[in-house]
């Protein structure tokens, strides 16, 4: 029972985590304009992995995609790659783990096969989570580096009356979503790996011991009670109870159309 709970919880946690990784990858707010020097700005800039956006005080938002591939920084390409690898591995992991769930019966699948699949999906979730965390961390590091560089150069080129203030960028919401989602996927993967140990069949097979009573020959096999009640780890037993797969509706909230600076 504990194994099923661990496996189920691991699956749900990973599912939430991967949904979060997908959301973070698609989000535009990976980096947002630092408002420290100008908290009441009339033009607010923010950037994602795929496009950069500008939100005016008028409520008008304009987004422009990065239509070049070669002209983009290598670090940004690396972050994109890490996030996509994370999503792909996570999606495959989810697919594998659905079939590995103890509460779902698929033909006459052995518990050993389910254990292997659980372990595989668990490893996939762990790698997926690590990819997401790595991707977000690389981007965050890039932001920190650029932030201090632009701070050092902030008022350079100030000639006479004219001031040129560089736009500085700080951590956007997507980074925090990515870190949390990556962490959840990682935790879910670990839980799946733990569940795998409980699913694996015990190697020790007890041999039947015969007891000869007067005039009767009764064979007693240990584990017989377990087998009849559906408990224990007898691999020959088919699980009669099917808990069914529960699906949850996911609700994603997006910023309002009129999100003013």
């Amino acid at each position: 029972m504990a194994v099923t709970a661990c496996q189920g919880l691991g699956f749900v946690v990973s599912l939430i985590g991967i949904a979060g990784i997908i959301a973070a990858t698609c989000m535009d707010q990976w980096s947002t304009q630092d408002l420290y020097n100008n908290p009441v700005t009339a033009v607010f800039n923010y950037q994602g992995l795929w496009r950069s956006c500008v939100r005016e005080s008028s409520g008008f938002t304009e987004c422009r995609g990065y239509f070049t591939l070669l002209g983009l920084p290598a670090m940004l390409q690396a972050v994109r790659a890490l996030m996509i690898v994370g999503i792909v591995l996570g999606a495959i992991g989810l697919l594998v783990s659905i079939f590995a769930l103890k509460c779902i019966r698929i033909g006459s699948m052995e518990d050993s096969a389910k254990a292997n699949m659980t372990l595989t999906s668990g490893i996939m979730f762990i790698v997926s989570g690590l990819c997401a965390i790595a991707g977000v961390s690389v981007f965050a590091n890039m932001l920190v580096t650029n932030f201090w560089m632009s701070t050092a150069n902030m008022y350079t080129g100030m000639g006479g009356m004219v001031q040129t203030v560089q736009t500085r960028y700080t951590f956007g919401a997507a980074l925090f979503v990515g870190w949390v989602a990556g962490g959840l996927t990682l935790i879910g993967g670990v839980m799946m790996c733990i569940a795998c140990r409980g699913l694996a069949p015990e190697e020790t097979n007890y041999k039947a011991v015969s007891y000869h009573a007067s005039g009767h020959s009764v064979a007693y096999k240990p584990g017989g009670f377990k087998a009849s009640t559906g408990f224990g780890s007898n691999t020959k037993n088919k699980k009669i109870y099917d808990g069914g797969a529960r699906t949850e509706d996911e609700v994603q909230s997006y910023p309002s159309k009129h999100d003013y600076v």
Epitope: V40, V43, S58, F60, V165, T167, S256
Partner: antibody, heavy 118, light 113 residues
């Protein structure tokens, strides 16, 4: 079409208060910011501030903090400018203007002349 | 605050001739995020409210005749009327839309020579 219709001219004594209204039609008031601009006789335009449509929170230019109050009544699609403790130098035409793409003032009221004289 | 300085204060041009008004800002109005200059031009005729002519430094508002054009980037901007018409007699203002408080130039009075 978008229209901003302001209340009529006002003649006030120093120390009194005045409330200028600006009725919006042809669009939803809560979708666009409302700006207030002052133009003293024979002078240029002075941006007084604006009121955010989603929160109704006003932002005032430095010279207009204190005696000037912006407000919105969405039920009647009207923006208001209230000036307290009127001074002679408040004599001007006050315009309301909608904030639009490019942070521009694309539609203006016809203006309300407020005259402060003893 | 961003200071907007227009030149000249007044300008007299013959009908059909080119009129040029300059506007200089104390800070860069070019937004790096979308490469747009947040500078707007308005026309104000006597006894009327201002009318939007050009935004984003060079984008003409719908309904504005194509003899009006805007140019410039960063801190230096120009409004050009290619062929002056009698109805173009007005005061022209530039406005910063990049940061609060929004500020206007002192205005340029355009007259017919």
């Amino acid at each position: 079409q978008v229209q901003l219709v302001q209340s009529g001219s006002e003649l006030k004594k120093p120390g009194a208060s005045v409330k200028v209204s600006c009725k919006a039609s042809g669009y939803t008031l809560t979708n666009y910011g409302m700006n207030w601009v002052r133009q003293a006789p024979g002078q240029g335009l002075e941006w007084m501030g604006w009121i955010r449509p989603n929160t109704g929170e006003p932002t005032y230019a430095e010279d207009f903090k204190g005696r000037f109050v912006f407000s919105l009544d969405t039920s009647v699609s009207t923006a208001y400018l209230q000036i307290c403790s009127l001074k002679a130098e408040d004599t001007a035409v006050y315009y309301c203007a909608r904030l639009y793409r490019g942070n521009t003032l694309d539609n203006w009221g016809q203006g309300t002349l407020v005259t402060v004289s003893s | 605050d961003i200071v907007m300085t227009q030149s000249p204060d007044s300008l007299a041009v013959s009908l059909g001739e080119r009129a040029t008004i300059n506007c200089k800002s104390s800070q860069n109005l070019l937004n790096s995020g979308n490469q747009r200059n947040y500078l707007t031009w308005y026309q104000q005729k006597p006894g009327q409210p201002p009318k939007l002519l050009i935004y984003w430094a060079s984008t003409r508002e719908s309904g504005v005749p194509d003899r009006f054009s805007g140019s410039g980037s960063g801190t230096d901007f120009t409004l050009t009327i290619s062929s002056l018409q009698a109805e173009d007699v007005a005061v022209y203002y530039c406005q910063n839309g990049y940061s609060f408080p929004f500020t206007f130039g002192q205005g340029t009075k355009l007259e017919i020579k």
